[in-house]
């Protein structure tokens, strides 16, 4: 028989982690493996049909994506949809596929809303999702004794798909669910310095444990301004939510692992400011299969898609599409073996959920709602040389914080700052006021 996979991803724009130039080679590798393995869909042919999720400008579109999905549905009657990755593109497509009872498989669509499976029935996320970041942060807070207050700042950049809004939304909601904690959130425009100044005035009254989602340059600017304002690492800790580790990469921008460095005359101050900074990224898979997969992926991307893939955490997305597709095909194979059909979306999806799978990204666990358990890394500066390195990983499956290579977190005072200042944010602690009174008497 024939099994049709309908792809709805950006076909022209290569900048998205889920661009077809990146995911296409991963799909090819997965399908080559299906052909090579007699236990997967014996006697079946798998073919892909493509639709674009981007508009004429090459930007993800909540109009183009559902139109492409509808066209693919009526023209090819696919057994499964692969993608979209962008939040606004995935939302309408996911609602349509739920109505059609056709599985949707993606390694994108990380926003909180896609976890609501009565609306997004049969949507399986084989990639990371933002609510899972909240699980990590909640575990971190418990361990460090921060169970009262946190502040989240997120940058707005025109045309960036509101990436930071969705990231902080998932983090915010999950942390509040997991801990009985007060969480404030503030938005700022990256290109408006007056916003930064306003943030710095607000910060001391709102939090000491601060999460920031922004570009690496905006984060560095904020850290420099915080240093100037005296918001230093003895009392504050700033977590950069840099999930793909952009700030830690070399190339055109900062030197590898030195996110404070620009060679612009402010590096000395920036290094000092970054003593108060930690960086949260997705965890880079360290299993040998992943490294081998990357080699093949890059080769295929160049040969068949005329695309040069850079190194970095973005490659975990095509790798997750690869693993997700293999998991789907495994589920179809099992469904057929039990007398089902390839159009039995519910049955196939149920076989994917609440299941573990050994893929190129390592041990992959899809939870009972069809979302992948996600691993994260926490990076911190080595005070000796100013380089950032992974100090601990979070294992999403076991929900454990895993200490790495004898390293420890760097706290300027030797211990983590409390999440609420000793006298409260507005010196409201009566004991502190008593002290002031006694000095006046």
């Amino acid at each position: 028989g024939n099994l049709t996979v309908a792809v709805v991803l950006p076909l022209a724009n290569t900048s998205y982690p889920w661009s077809w130039a990146r995911v296409g080679p991963a799909v090819e590798l997965a399908l080559a493996q299906v052909k090579a393995r007699p236990d997967l869909l014996p006697g079946w042919t798998v073919r892909t049909v493509l639709g674009s999720s981007e508009n004429a400008l090459g930007v993800c579109s909540d109009t183009a994506a559902p139109l492409a999905a509808v066209d693919l549905k009526w023209e090819h009657n696919p057994a499964v949809f692969l993608g979209p990755g962008c939040v606004y593109a995935a939302a309408p497509v996911g609602r349509f596929t739920a109505h059609w009872r056709v599985p949707l498989l993606t390694a994108g669509a990380p926003a909180l809303g896609f976890g609501v499976k009565d609306e997004y029935a049969l949507t399986t996320r084989a990639g990371p999702s933002y609510a899972k970041l909240g699980d990590f942060v909640a575990a971190l807070h418990r361990r460090l004794g921060w169970e009262r207050q946190a502040l989240m700042l997120y940058a707005y950049r025109p045309g960036d798909e509101e990436h930071c809004f969705f990231l902080v939304e998932g983090l915010f909601m999950r942390v509040r669910d997991r801990l009985n904690i007060t969480v404030d959130h503030l938005e700022f425009a990256e290109d408006d310095l007056s916003h930064y100044t306003r943030l710095l005035r607000t910060m001391p009254r709102k939090g000491r444990v601060i999460y920031i989602c922004s570009s690496p340059d905006a984060f560095r600017t904020l850290m420099l301004l915080a240093l100037e304002a005296g918001l230093c690492g003895e009392d504050y800790v700033f977590f950069h939510l840099d999930i793909f580790g952009q700030s830690l990469q070399g190339g055109q921008g900062p030197a590898p692992r030195r996110p404070w460095e620009r060679g612009d005359g402010q590096d000395v101050s920036a290094r000092q400011a970054f003593q108060a900074a930690k960086i949260i990224t997705y965890k880079d898979p360290d299993n040998p299969e992943y490294l081998e997969f990357l080699k093949q992926l890059k080769h295929l991307a160049y040969e068949q898609f005329n695309f040069t893939m850079e190194d970095g955490l973005v490659n975990t997305i095509p790798a997750s599409f690869h693993d997700g597709l293999l998991l789907y095909i495994q589920a179809v194979t099992e469904t057929l073996a039990h007398g089902g059909t390839v159009t039995d979306g519910e049955n196939i999806t149920q076989r994917m959920w609440n299941r573990s799978f050994q893929g190129v990204t390592g041990y992959l666990k899809i939870d009972s709602s069809g979302d992948r358990e996600t691993d994260f890394s926490l990076w911190d500066m080595d005070p000796e040389n100013g380089a950032f390195r992974v100090v601990l990983n979070y294992n999403g499956t076991s929900q454990e914080l895993v200490a790495v290579s004898g390293r420890k977190l760097n706290w300027p005072l030797g211990y983590p700052p409390p999440d609420i200042p000793k006298c409260g944010f507005d010196n409201e602690d009566p004991a502190c006021n008593q002290d002031h009174l006694s000095t006046l008497e």
Epitope: R143, E400, L401, A403, G406
Partner: antibody, heavy 120, light 107 residues
């Protein structure tokens, strides 16, 4: 509650090896490091080395380099310290202790100690 | 390796006395220093971490201070159960190193 339980006392001949175990319970094994400390009779504390249970990373004090090997078994939450080429000066109490790399609290819980006697 | 020099090596004092023990590092270790108490036949017990943070369950008569290279452990009013040997430990980098210990005896 957090516990580190060490193996029993050992008597060894010079030149032999000893393997002391330290079984952890009451906390997430891979979230903390385990250190080993030696204390000869009537002497002070001497840091021997550290092992990271998650990845097996080790760092040893110069004094013990080449003679000590620290390993772990994550299936049983146990860390082992192997000291080879024993000499009489190695007669000592050996302690394992836990270290939190997040809050950076050093050696907050200790094992009860294992006495190793080296004698011909 | 960082050397830790503890002084005095022994000290006689009476119940109720205020006692101070010092520890000097051969290079700056920021606040990365702990103080331990050890009684005969027992494992050491952590009193102070990060130079001045009292470990939970430790009486408030114990306090620590200092940063960089010079550190102090103070017992404000000695109790009978405080007679023991005290050690400092630098946990700034590997290899960790202990001071040679201060034996606190009853006068």
């Amino acid at each position: 509650q957090v516990q580190l339980v060490q193996s029993g006392a050992e008597v060894k001949k010079p030149g032999a090896s000893v393997k002391v175990s330290c079984k952890a319970s009451g906390y997430t094994f891979t979230s903390y490091y385990i250190h080993w400390v030696r204390q000869a009779p009537g002497q002070g504390l001497e840091w021997m080395g550290i092992i990271s249970p998650s990845d097996g990373y080790t760092s040893y004090a110069q004094n013990f380099q080449g003679r000590v090997t620290m390993t772990r078994d994550t299936s049983t939450n146990t860390v082992y310290m192997d000291l080879s080429s024993l000499r009489s000066e190695d007669t000592a109490m050996f302690y394992c202790a836990r270290n939190d790399p997040l809050t950076t609290v050093a050696l907050d819980y200790w094992g009860q100690g294992t006495l190793v006697t080296v004698s011909s | 390796a960082i050397q830790m020099t503890q002084s005095p090596s022994s000290l006689s004092a009476s119940v109720g006395d205020r006692v101070t023990i010092t520890c000097r590092a051969s290079q700056g270790i920021r606040y990365d220093l702990g103080w331990f108490q050890q009684k005969p036949g027992k494992a050491p017990k952590l009193l102070i971490h990060a130079a001045s943070s009292l470990q939970s369950g430790v009486p408030s008569r114990f306090s620590g201070s200092g940063s960089g290279t010079d550190f102090t452990l103070t017992i404000s009013s000695l109790q009978p159960e405080d007679f023991a040997t005290y050690y400092c430990l630098q946990d700034y980098n590997y290899p960790f190193t202990f001071g040679q210990g201060t034996k606190l005896e009853i006068k």
